[in-house]
């Protein structure tokens, strides 16, 4: 599977990626940080 | 240095699946681009398709969507391209491949994949 | 699909000679990025591919400068300035810019 945007370009896909993954890692700071503060 | 080291040859007959593996050592192998390309005897080379393990995210190439399944295991740092209904045509060496700067800086030794009955 | 298509399909050149391979592509390879994703890789008989040049013209580390890549847009060039007798080998364009990634068939470098 893919759950990026489908694109036909490969650096497109990379970048896509590539928010991702930053992302993810806001996403999962934010959350480390709501469990710390309970 | 980035080393991919794959599985041994296989034989098997038509019809049958084979999965190929290519372990990594030497990277970051969550964070790349693994690719799968394979070349038949005395031919070119033919792209399959790639998966970026962070997320377990595939691309294919049409040709081989619905027969070819990309994987990866991040806790052994190690691709995996399964290839089912087999037919003679598919014998071919597999490769894998690493992304660096859009394009593939680290290939694996190659795997030979025969088909016959 | 994008086609490649190389050109000449093998050739043989004297040692200390210049060996010129070319490469087109059916579409423009230049990306919204600005990059062109035209690579060429090196293939000797036995042994997996080797990246040689990656965007168009920017050698791998350890590539003898008499290899160089040039071109843009559609049409791209590999030339070994002074043919080596280790130069013999299969050369591989292939683009890296759209989905499939393509390659071209490939052309036979030898000794004349």
């Known amino acids: 599977h893919s759950d990026g945007i489908f694109t036909d370009s490969y650096s497109r896909y990379r970048k896509q990626m590539a928010v991702k993954k930053y992302l993810a890692a806001v996403l999962g700071k934010r959350y480390k940080q709501r469990v710390k503060n309970k | 240095e980035v080393q991919l080291v794959q599985s041994g040859a296989e034989v098997k007959k038509p019809g049958s699946s084979v999965k190929v593996s290519c372990k990594a050592s030497?990277?970051?192998?969550?964070?790349?681009?693994m690719h799968w390309v394979r070349q038949a005897p005395g031919q070119g080379l033919e792209w399959m398709g790639l998966?970026?393990?962070?997320?377990?995210?595939?691309r294919y190439a049409q040709k081989f969507q619905g027969r070819v399944t990309i994987t990866a295991d991040e806790s052994t740092s190690t691709a995996y391209m399964e290839l089912s209904s087999l037919r003679s045509e598919d014998t071919a060496v597999y490769y894998c491949?690493?992304?660096?700067?859009?394009?593939?800086?680290?290939w694996g030794q190659g795997t030979l994949v025969t088909v016959s009955s | 699909d994008i086609v490649m298509t190389q050109s000449p399909d093998s050739l043989a050149v004297s040692l200390g000679e210049r060996a010129t391979i070319n490469c087109k592509s059916s579409?423009?390879?230049?990306?919204?990025?600005?990059?062109?994703?035209l690579n060429w890789l090196q293939q000797k008989p036995g042994q997996p591919p080797k990246r040689l040049i990656y965007?168009?013209?920017t050698r791998e580390s350890g590539v003898p400068d008499r290899f160089s890549g040039s071109g843009s847009g559609t049409d791209f060039t590999l030339t070994i300035s002074s043919l080596q007798a280790e130069d013999v080998a299969v050369y591989y364009c292939?683009?890296?810019?759209?989905?499939?990634?393509?390659f071209g068939g490939g052309t036979k470098v030898e000794i004349k």
């Open positions: 491949a690493i992304d660096y700067d859009g394009s593939f800086a680290y």
């Open positions: 030497g990277g970051t192998f969550s964070d790349s681009y």
């Open positions: 998966i970026y393990p962070i997320f377990a995210d595939t």
């Open positions: 579409q423009s390879l230049l990306d919204s990025d600005g990059k062109t994703y």
């Open positions: 965007l168009v013209s």
């Open positions: 292939w683009q890296g810019t759209h989905f499939p990634l393509t």
